[in-house]
Every structure is written in structure tokens, then in C-alpha cells.
């Protein structure tokens, strides 16, 4: 943005109203007064190029600084060759000073040359040559110094003509400021511009109305140059939640629309199954039955709960349940379905249940699965056991019902083998079992596990179709680990407990005998 | 009627020996596996090690994590078992109690490992402190 | 080692039933006693190879045994059944008694 100028003086302005002053009074510098265009034009001029030694000052009037910082005096003047006066003039100049002087307050008619400090020496781009002069074709030239910083309630230029042919016609003198701005939604104060040229003053926006500065953005910032120029623009406002970019303001959302959040998008149409929106909103209401989780976005349709598992099996195998579901034919809207399964036992002889979480063991957790099927083990014979498969999604949790299907089994597998020994020798043990007479028509063969006690390390197995076995070539005077498990078609059926069997020592005769 | 009587030192510095005796009164004292346990306060029962007299032998079995500091012995013709357990610290405070299983260790041929505890010792306090 | 797992609390209303988990790998297999302990007294047998009662022992307490999880039962709980109940089988791979961390019991 262009810098703006706030002028102090301005003598071409002032139609010679301004009465500086000059010193030596009488001598040097003279006010003229010329028509440029049919409109008078004045001028301050002195040409005293034939005698030595010149030493004449023209002084402006106080000027009151006010805000300036530093200050831009801009000058407009002539200069003639001192090569167009006769002889040359030895004396002639072609420069004149520029002085300046702070005080606060206007010493009137007394000057004193000590109190200025020089600015420059002026001089000139063009010189005006006899022929120009002659033909009234002047060389304007156009200079401009600054100062700063200044401090004191005002200040004087003063000029000092040391022996040339100028005329002065334009003196003005300005500061300048940044304007005000609008930009990324912040507005920026008109700002005077610092009086140092390297460093640039940083100047705070605020935001316009309905914009803030993002979570984590930085706040709005731009700084102004020596020339009143806005440089390096820093942080942004955006529009608030509810409210869009419409050129240099923020606008609510028309209804049907909304914005959730701070940022430079625009409104969005309300999303599938919510409610129409008034003006302005920051989200979109769930239509009654549909819900938003927490951690959905606002652009994401409203969802519902999935409905229960379509269709859910139980599929015993000994002492295991498979079950198996599809998954719910309305699954709410949302991918994220997790199934959860539980068990509930019944003990058939009192009727009495409870959860057998505890008791039981799953091919993977039960909480949470992904999968459409889990495997349960370690259930008990003779008891009956409800599964329940329930779907759940991200909004499930919003509301009180449930969606969930239930399947029943009863475990009949096999109860483990009652056993006792029956005989036994020096080398050998007789072992026989027996178990309940309904189950024994699904069993098609025993097999007998045994080992010696101590030895972890190695074991034999000996399978049979009866409820008896002689195992031989036994240590005398041993004990043996002996166990029998029940094979069934649908696998293993209950191992019995693990007996501890010893034969006879061999001082200890008697054959067989128990 | 079994009945066991427990006794011994019921304070100890660290790195002395604990040593417990029980009695075991009214039954029969041969063919049984004698246990110790002992329980540290506030906390669970922990099984020490169990003895067995069987002719002129002494079977022992120890718990692993003590095994290295535990000494079970037996004194027949007192009907007799006691407990030994060197280098103490302050882990090893706890009520000690002697058992005795339900059955014999085999009858007939059939053997009980680890059978259940029906009789047990009234309990030692032993404190291990400095 | 073989590792016994007991809930460290089980609560109950006085006339309901109480029933205290022993999880262990094929406990089945094995033969689960049950003790109960009172502050300040040795234990007492309850139930021994998994479901036998003690001379003494009332009929309200039961247990059961298969696959990993053996259970004590205690039907029509009374006040003075509240006490720290303990399993305890014998592990034939290393040879020792192996006790469950203990249940406590509590008689709302």
C-alpha cells in the first residue's frame, strides 16, 4: 500500500503569505512574484553571484512538528550557469545549503546561525544556460532530503546562499504515514511511519468483525516502512465457525449451510440426515434416531446404530462352540461395526445361569471383533450356554438399546472316564473305566496315556475299543501316571483325571493282586 | 482323632535358620507325605515341601523357589517332623503351619500326590527382623 | 511352573449362591481340593478331588471340575461362610502343590 503524505508546509500553497525571514534583512534572498498560466506565482530568489564572499540566509517560519517522526522536505528550484554572467563570476556558486534547526517554541525575528544544523548541500541536476534564460525556458530541478529523529515541538529550514543565481520556488515539507488497511481480515491503523530507515515498526491488526486468529495461528501483524509502506505481513484472521470469506468481511452461512470451524474454506451444505440450519450455524442437528460420534467430523452424515447380526449359528464340537454371524443388513451408515459376544451359563439341574466369562475360553477376544466368527472353549458337559452377538458402531454408545442376536447350545460331550485299577503285578497294571451308558454309543476308542512318575520327558499311548486295558512291561516297584480320554467323531472327548498307579515290588509276591 | 502340634522360635534375626518342630498325635504316622506351608501376612498359602518315612528311607520333595534353603526331617520314634529353612530375611515372615494329607501316600497300588490337607497345625508367627 | 488363578473377590447376597473360580491349564485332569480360611485360623478342607465333601463339611458346599475351570459352589450363603477360600492341586510335571492366589468372600 502507498505510503500517505501529511504535509507540515507548503510554500508553494501559501501565495507568499508566509513572510520567512531573511538575514541579512534587506540583502540576498527576496520574495518575487511571477504569472505562470495566468495565475501568480512566488518565489524566493538571490543572485548576488558578483560579489565575493556571500553569506545570506532565508529561515521559514516555525513549523509544528505534532506526530512527524521524521520529515521529507521536497524542493523545487532553479539554478543559473555562473558561466552566463559576464567574467564568469569568479565568485559564483552553483550550490546552496539546507539547514535545519529544532526548539519548542518560535523564537520570532531572532535568529542565530548556531543553533542550525546542516542538512546538505543542494545542488543542482540541471543548470539553467543564457540561451534558456533568454527564451524563458527554465531547468526546474526537484530534490528531497529527510530528517529524523526529531523531538522537539518544531523546527526551522533555513537556507544559505553562499554566491549563486537560485530561485526557489516550491518548499514543502512532509511526514508520512501507513494508511489504514484491510487485509487477511485484519484491520490495520494508520500508522506513522518511524523515523529509523533500517527498522520497520510493527503494528497489531485486529480482526474484522466475526474472524479471529486460528488455535495456534499467529495473530496478525504487518509492519510499517520509513516511506509509509505496509511490509511483511504476519499471521491471518480467518473466519469464525458459522461465517465465510465474502471479499474483505466474514458473512454467516446461509441456512442449509454450515461452517465448523475457523478457516479459510467456505459453508458447506448440511450433510445427509440432519435438520435444515438457520443462518450462521456451526453444525447441522442429527435428524431424531441419528447421531454424530464425538470424534466425527461435522461434514460426515448423521448415523444410527447398525441393526443386529443377520443371522448367527452355534456349532458344537465336544467341549467347543463355533459361531458364526453375517453382518447386519443396516450397518447405520458407518464402516467402524465391531461385534461383541458374551455367554451366559445354566446349570440344567437348578435352572439357575450366570456369565461364564470366566470359565470359558475365546479363539480371540470377545470385545471388539472385527471378524464374523470366534471359536469359544473349556466348556463344561451337561451345560447349557446362550451366546449373544452384539454389532456396535461409533454411535452405539449414544443410545440404550441394543442390537444384538442369541444363539443356545447344550454341551453333551463326553463326561471323562471314571477309572480304577484293577490288578497289578511286579510289571504290569490292569486299568479299566467306564462311562455313562448313553454316551458310550459315540465313542469309538479309548486311548490310555501312561508314564512314569518323574519322567516328563517321554510317554506311551495305547488305544482300545474296550473299557480295559493290561498295560505290561512295567518297572517294578514304580509308580505310573494313567490316563483315558474318549475319542469320538467330533474329536476328544473329556480326559479323565491323571491316576497315580504303582506296581508290586518284587518282595512283595502275589500275583495281580489289588 | 489326628491332631498336629507345632512350636519353635517365633523371632529371628536375618541369616539365622528358622526351625520348627510338629507332633503329630492319635494316628498313624508312617505311609503319609508331612507337609509345611506357610502363608505371609495379609497374602496367600505357599507350599514349602512335604516328607515321607517308607522303611528306613525319607522321600522328600521341596518347592523349587526354596529348595536351595529347605531341610524337612523326621524323627520316627517321636512321631516327629520339623522344618528347617537357613539364611532368613524379611520376605520370609510369615504364620507357619505343618499338615497332613487326607490318605496315605498308596494304598493298594493307588497313589495320591498332593492329596488335600484335612489336619493342619494351630500356626507359628515367625518375624524376621533386624 | 503351573499357575492357579482365582477372582481375589467374589460378593454375595446371605440365601444366594456363591460361586468361586480355579483357572488353570487341563485342571480337569487334575484333582482340585478346597480349603477356607478364616482371620486369624489354619484352613479348613471343604472339598476335596473336585467335588467330595469332608464328614462335617454341609451339603451347601459343591464343587465341580473340567476342561481349565473348576468351581466352588456355596448354595444359600449365610453370614458365617465369609471367609478366604483356596484351591490347591498337585502338578505332576514338577511334582509340587500348587495353592490358587485365594478368593475372599464377602456376605453383602
Known amino acids: 500500500a502507498q505510503g500517505k503524505e501529511v504535509v507540515l508546509l507548503d510554500f508553494a500553497a501559501a501565495g507568499g503569505e508566509l513572510g520567512w525571514l531573511t538575514h541579512p534583512y534587506g540583502k540576498g534572498w527576496d520574495l518575487m512574484q511571477n504569472i505562470m498560466n495566468d495565475m501568480p506565482i512566488y518565489m524566493y530568489s538571490v543572485c548576488n553571484v558578483m560579489s565575493g564572499d556571500q553569506d545570506n540566509w532565508l529561515r521559514t517560519n516555525w513549523v509544528y512538528r505534532g506526530e512527524a517522526e521524521r520529515i521529507f522536505i521536497e524542493l523545487k528550484f532553479t539554478v543559473r550557469d555562473c558561466n552566463s554572467f559576464p567574467g564568469g563570476a569568479s565568485s559564483c556558486k552553483e550550490t546552496f545549503n539546507l539547514y535545519y534547526a529544532e526548539s519548542d517554541l518560535d523564537y520570532g525575528t531572532n535568529f542565530q546561525k548556531r543553533l542550525f544544523t546542516k542538512i546538505d548541500t543542494i545542488a543542482p541536476d540541471e543548470i539553467t544556460v543564457s540561451s534558456d534564460f533568454e527564451a524563458r525556458h527554465v531547468k526546474l530541478n526537484v530534490e528531497e532530503r529527510s530528517v529524523g529523529p526529531l523531538t522537539r515541538k518544531g523546527f526551522y529550514l533555513a537556507f544559505q546562499d553562499i554566491g549563486a543565481c537560485v530561485a526557489l520556488l516550491s518548499v514543502r515539507v512532509y511526514y508520512k504515514k501507513c494508511p489504514e488497511l484491510l487485509q487477511g481480515l485484519a484491520h490495520f491503523p494508520e500508522t506513522i511511519a518511524g523515523s529509523d530507515a533500517p527498522s520497520l515498526a510493527t503494528v497489531a491488526g485486529t480482526c474484522v468483525d466475526h474472524a479471529v486468529v486460528p488455535p495456534g495461528g499467529e495473530e496478525p501483524r504487518m509492519h510499517c516502512a520509513v516511506d509509509g509502506e505496509w511490509l511483511v505481513p504476519i499471521g491471518q484472521c480467518l473466519c469464525q465457525a458459522g461465517y465465510e470469506k465474502v471479499e474483505d468481511a466474514c458473512q454467516a452461512c446461509s441456512p442449509g449451510f454450515f461452517k465448523f470451524e475457523a478457516s479459510e474454506s467456505p459453508c458447506l451444505e448440511c450433510p445427509e440426515h440432519t435438520l435444515p440450519s438457520p443462518e450462521g450455524a456451526t453444525s447441522c442437528e442429527c435428524e431424531e434416531g441419528f447421531f454424530r460420534a464425538p470424534q466425527d467430523p461435522a461434514s460426515m452424515p448423521c448415523t444410527r446404530p447398525p441393526s443386529a447380526p443377520h443371522y448367527l449359528t452355534a456349532v458344537g464340537m465336544g467341549a467347543k462352540v463355533e459361531l458364526r454371524w453375517t453382518p447386519p443388513q443396516d450397518s447405520g451408515g458407518r464402516e467402524d461395526i465391531v461385534y461383541s459376544v458374551t455367554c451366559e451359563q445354566c446349570w440344567p439341574e437348578s435352572g439357575e445361569c450366570g456369565p461364564c466369562e470366566a470359565s470359558v475360553r475365546y479363539s480371540e477376544p470377545p470385545h471388539g471383533l472385527t471378524r464374523t466368527s470366534v471359536t469359544v472353549s473349556d466348556l463344561e458337559p451337561h451345560m447349557n450356554y446362550t451366546f449373544t452377538v452384539e454389532a456396535r458402531n461409533g454411535v452405539s454408545g449414544l443410545v440404550t438399546s441394543r442390537s444384538f442376536r442369541t444363539a443356545s447350545v447344550s454341551i453333551n460331550q463326553t463326561e471323562p472316564p471314571k477309572v480304577r485299577l484293577e490288578g497289578r503285578s511286579t510289571t504290569s497294571l490292569s486299568v479299566s473305566w467306564s462311562i455313562p451308558p448313553p454316551q458310550q454309543s459315540r465313542v469309538w476308542k479309548y486311548e490310555v496315556t501312561y508314564r512314569k512318575k518323574g519322567d516328563s520327558n517321554s510317554y506311551n499311548v495305547r488305544r482300545t475299543e474296550g473299557f480295559s486295558v493290561t498295560l505290561d512291561d512295567l518297572a517294578p516297584d514304580t509308580t505310573y501316571l494313567v490316563q483315558v480320554q474318549a475319542l469320538t467323531q467330533e474329536g476328544q472327548g473329556a480326559g479323565s483325571k491323571v491316576h497315580e498307579f504303582q506296581t508290586l515290588s518284587p518282595e512283595g509276591s502275589g500275583n495281580l493282586a489289588v | 482323632q489326628v491332631q498336629l502340634q507345632q512350636w519353635g522360635a517365633g523371632l529371628l534375626k536375618p541369616s539365622e535358620t528358622l526351625s520348627l518342630t510338629c507332633a503329630v498325635y492319635?494316628?498313624?504316622?508312617?505311609?503319609?507325605?508331612w507337609s509345611w506351608i506357610r502363608q505371609p501376612p495379609g497374602k496367600g498359602l505357599e507350599w514349602i515341601g512335604e516328607?515321607?518315612?517308607?522303611?528306613?528311607?525319607?522321600?522328600?520333595n521341596y518347592n523349587p523357589s526354596l529348595k536351595s534353603r529347605v531341610t524337612i526331617s523326621v524323627d520316627t520314634s517321636k512321631n516327629q517332623f520339623s522344618l528347617k529353612l537357613s539364611s532368613v530375611t524379611a520376605a520370609d515372615t510369615a504364620v507357619y503351619y505343618c499338615?497332613?494329607?487326607?490318605?496315605?501316600?498308596?494304598?493298594?497300588?493307588?497313589?495320591?500326590?498332593?492329596?488335600?490337607?484335612?489336619?493342619w497345625g494351630q500356626g507359628t508367627m515367625v518375624t524376621v527382623a533386624s | 511352573s503351573y499357575v492357579l488363578t482365582q477372582p481375589p473377590s467374589v460378593s454375595v447376597a446371605p440365601g444366594q449362591t456363591a460361586r468361586i473360580t480355579c483357572r488353570g491349564n487341563?485342571?480337569?485332569?487334575?484333582?482340585v481340593h478346597w480349603y477356607q480360611q478364616k482371620p486369624g485360623q489354619a484352613p479348613v478342607l471343604v472339598v476335596y478331588?473336585?467335588?467330595d465333601r469332608p464328614s462335617g463339611i454341609p451339603e451347601r458346599f459343591s464343587g465341580s471340575n473340567s476342561g481349565n475351570t473348576a468351581t466352588l459352589t456355596i448354595s444359600r450363603v449365610e453370614a458365617g461362610d465369609e471367609a478366604d477360600y483356596y484351591c490347591?492341586?498337585?502338578?505332576?510335571?514338577?511334582?509340587?502343590?500348587?495353592f490358587g492366589g485365594g478368593t475372599k468372600l464377602t456376605v453383602l
Open positions: 499338615a497332613k494329607p487326607l490318605r496315605p501316600h498308596c494304598t493298594n497300588g493307588v497313589c495320591y500326590s498332593g492329596d488335600a490337607f484335612d489336619i
Open positions: 492319635g494316628g498313624s504316622f508312617s505311609g503319609y507325605y
Open positions: 516328607i515321607n518315612h517308607r522303611g528306613s528311607i525319607n522321600y522328600n
Open positions: 487341563n485342571i480337569g485332569s487334575k484333582n
Open positions: 478331588d473336585d467335588s
Open positions: 490347591q492341586v498337585w502338578d505332576h510335571s514338577s511334582d509340587h502343590v500348587v
